[in-house]
């Protein structure tokens, strides 16, 4: 919309139709040119020239948000707005006030003014926005995570929608969803967004708000899935009666009436166009929901969304088809259903999809539900290779596990390169801490073997001046390595093999650790200081630093390493999509920096560097350091925790995964 | 801005061959499922074919099967349909889809088949 005022004054016009449509989670330019017949103006001959200031702003029926002020070549923009509006063209192109918005948000809807004053001149455009389109969390009819890739898409094509993109859950997040449920997203990476942290919901961001992700997943992994519905034409309608209906008949009373059932996709559409109904109706996918936008307690539980109505409280399975519902009907030619052969399925591979509420609804559950699931745990969907009930972690730790894990289970059988006979107990378990929120992140506690006069060392009180002793494994495997390998692994990761009065010492702080590593003088040992089962060594029940003696060169196990002091500064690096390990390395170079070793987070550990972010090292690991313990950051323990791929602590991440860095300069 | 660009289509004798194309940008082509839909003058859509993100599985409507090929090129984001055999009744404006919704699809290429 043009406000022009008379012909030689200042003139601003959008030459584009309003409303302009834009999909949520994209970017958006908004042209604005201004034409000044007084530019340059000059005031005297003195005082430099006036020029024009431009404003754009946002204006609603309540009040009006100025996003940014430009002029003489600089733009300040509001800090609310920092990042998501900016003039491209300005000043290169001093008469072109075109706005871009980045990430597009539901809220981001409204009027638009671009606003250009010279002197005592003064011209404004404004143009509507709309910012089109919903995300919702699916799932299959029968349980939770049970979507391949490919039909994770087929479930948002059969419901009016396609599979959401990251921008899209970034924005709808930004929007306050909520959802404790791991989906796929058409990256093919598995993603959910959470506002409120809580255990069984912490993935890899711990105690903060994000959306949380587990990187590029394998296609034939399970999760539920994260939907887009675009907009639509049509209208969504109740259709009701005295009696209700049952699917069947719902499903021909819209027909009767020239329509068929919604898809839940358009009911998210009408609900977002504000629809509001009290009571539950039957949807094409056979799922029972109803709509609501204004909030009581007698509806939905006082909360906003689509509600969902579940044959079990554990929010799985549909209602029984020949229950009574109302029908929720779609009429609109602008949706063409896509026949189920298009999906290569039938009888019994049918899925139908459900959804969990927005926001989040977590219902009181029976005590025989597995607790874990409620909270939104993830239920490890492996192929039973092991003769033993699923692990439940969270939804940050979900993997499908792989058939290579082999068949040795969680506590491991010290699985060795080569046999030899121990006459005492070999420490048979991958190091636990009794607490940890992180499924497969190990609790290594690692104590820091400093003191300075005066200083209080939590926790006990280490003798050696500087540095620290730490365990190391390769990501692969347990025990893997020969004494030769294990001081060069040391080396490559920026420390040296310990003595064992460094891990004497270390022990005496309080350090433990149930797996046996090579130390300088090639023995073999561990520390351990609340003696349990598998990790009694040749002490038996008293603590202490178990040892095997002087060890033959070429036998395997993990080592100890120690560094000292750190000659220079590891940081912690981010960005919104995070790193692939190849993109970490390529972020710290352009830091003038390389990726940290695992040795100097160590350093950077006990010099004080607490992070509740898994990032990648340099060896392919991922690792954070925690200085302050609490719940939600790796357990009750301080020390620097590792992610391994397995529940039996060994394997690396997936290079391709993407997650935080610790660069190292 | 999300994109479907539709080519190849022109007249052709029956038994003849023609290859369709459908160049495609604005989102995540390699992980969407594709499809091509087409509709006669007069008749109401029919989905021809179909194919998954990463073209490892293929699907057709039962009129085309043997006849139609539904490929994507990832790498240059493109869809194609090899039709050959062609009938008279697979006449038709032919449209490159990523959903079921009709507005986000391309604007077509026609298919006659004519002797």
């Known amino acids: 919309e043009e406000v022009p005022d008379h012909d030689n004054s200042l003139s601003v016009s959008i030459p584009q139709p309003s409303p302009l449509k834009a999909l949520l989670g994209t970017s958006l330019t908004i042209p604005c040119y201004f034409i000044d017949p007084m530019h340059p103006v000059t005031t005297a001959p003195s005082t430099a020239p006036l020029t024009p200031r431009i404003k754009w702003s946002r204006v609603s029926k309540e009040k009006e948000v100025v996003l940014l002020v430009a002029t003489e070549g600089q733009v300040r923009v509001n800090s609310i707005y920092q990042d998501k509006v900016s003039l491209p063209n300005y000043p290169a192109i001093p008469s072109d006030a075109t706005l871009e918005i980045q990430n597009l948000r539901s809220n981001d809807s409204g009027i638009y003014r671009c606003e250009v004053m010279h002197g005592i001149e003064d011209s404004e455009a404004t143009l509507e926005v709309i910012v089109k389109g919903i995300v919702f969390h699916y799932r299959a009819i029968s349980t939770r995570y049970t979507l391949d890739f490919d039909r994770a898409q087929r479930a948002c094509l059969q419901n009016s929608a396609i599979i959401a993109t990251p921008e899209q859950l970034q924005a709808a997040y930004e929007d306050g969803f909520h959802q404790c449920d791991a989906g796929w997203l058409a990256d093919q990476t598995v993603r959910y967004p959470i506002h409120t942290p809580r255990e069984g919901c912490y993935g890899d961001k711990d105690e903060f708000p994000g959306v949380r992700t587990y990187g590029i997943r394998d296609t034939n992994e399970t999760y539920d899935v994260y939907c887009f519905a675009e907009e639509m034409e049509g209208e969504v309608f109740y259709a009701t009666s005295p009696e209700k209906f049952t699917f069947q008949e719902a499903a021909n009373e819209c027909r009767t009436v020239g329509a068929r059932l919604a898809t839940t996709g358009q009911l998210y559409l009408a609900w977002q166009g504000g629809m509001d109904m009290c009571s539950a109706g039957w949807l094409a996918d056979r799922s029972v929901r109803y709509p609501i936008s204004k909030a009581r307690p007698n509806c939905g539980g006082n909360l906003l969304g689509v509600r969902t109505v579940y044959l079990h409280a554990n929010q799985t399975g549909y209602p029984d088809p020949s229950s009574r519902y109302d029908a929720i009907c779609y009429t609109g030619e602008d949706f063409v259903d896509i026949p189920e052969n298009f999906f290569g399925v039938g009888g019994e591979e049918d899925i139908t999809i459900q959804t969990v509420t927005w926001p989040d609804l977590e219902l009181p559950l029976p005590r025989n539900i597995t607790e874990g699931e409620a909270r939104g745990n993830v239920i490890l969907t492996a192929k039973p290779i092991f003769d033993m009930s699923p692990t439940v972690s969270e939804p940050g730790e979900a993997l499908t596990l792989a058939p290579e894990v082999g068949t040795t289970v969680f506590p491991e059988a010290g699985e060795r390169t080569e046999k030899t006979t121990r006459p005492w107990g070999f420490p048979e378990e991958a190091t636990r801490g009794p607490d940890s929120a992180t499924a497969f992140a190990s609790e290594d506690l690692v104590v820091r073997v400093t003191i300075s006069p005066g200083a209080v060392e939590v926790p006990g009180q280490p003798r050696l001046p500087g540095g620290v002793v730490f365990h190391y494994r390769p990501g692969s495997t347990r025990y893997s390595l020969t004494f030769e390998e294990a001081q060069q692994a040391c080396i490559r990761t920026g420390a040296a093999i310990a003595s064992p009065e460094q891990l004497q010492a270390a022990y005496e702080a309080g350090y433990e650790q149930c797996d046996a590593g090579w130390l300088q003088d090639q023995t073999v040992r561990y520390p351990i200081v609340s003696p349990r089962t598998p990790c009694v060594g040749d002490k038996d029940s008293s603590p202490g630093v178990r040892t095997y003696g002087v060890r033959p060169s070429s036998e395997t196990y993990d080592v100890y390493c120690y560094v000292d002091k750190l000659e220079g500064e590891v940081f912690f690096a981010t960005q919104m999509e995070q790193f692939t390990f190849q993109e970490a390395q390529a972020f710290c170079a352009a830091q003038n920096a390389t990726l940290a070793s695992t040795g100097q987070l160590y350093a950077a550990w006990s010099q004080g560097l607490d992070k509740c972010y898994a990032g990648w090292l340099a060896d392919g690991t991922l690792r954070y350091p925690i200085v302050n313990p609490r719940p939600a950051c790796g357990g009750d323990k301080p020390g620097v925790r590792t992610v391994y791929l397995y529940p039996n602590q060994t394997g690396l991440p997936d290079p391709l995964s993407k997650h935080h860095a610790f660069c190292f300069r | 801005e999300v994109q479907l660009v539709e080519s190849g289509g022109g007249l052709v004798q029956p038994g003849g061959s023609l290859r369709l194309s459908c160049s495609a940008s604005?989102?995540?082509?390699?992980?969407?499922?594709m499809f091509w839909v087409r509709q006669a003058p007069g008749k109401d859509y029919e989905w021809v074919a179909s194919?998954?993100?990463?073209?490892?599985?293929?699907y057709y409507d039962d009129s085309v099967k043997g006849r139609f090929t539904i490929s994507r090129d990832s790498a240059k984001n493109t869809l194609y349909l090899e039709m050959n055999n062609l009938k008279p009744e697979d006449t038709a404006l032919y449209f490159c889809?990523?959903?079921?919704?009709?507005?986000?699809w391309g604007q077509g290429t026609q298919v006659t088949v004519s002797s």
């Open positions: 604005g989102f995540t082509f390699s992980g969407s499922w």
């Open positions: 889809a990523r959903s079921p919704r009709v507005g986000s």
């Open positions: 194919i998954n993100s990463s073209g490892g599985r293929t």
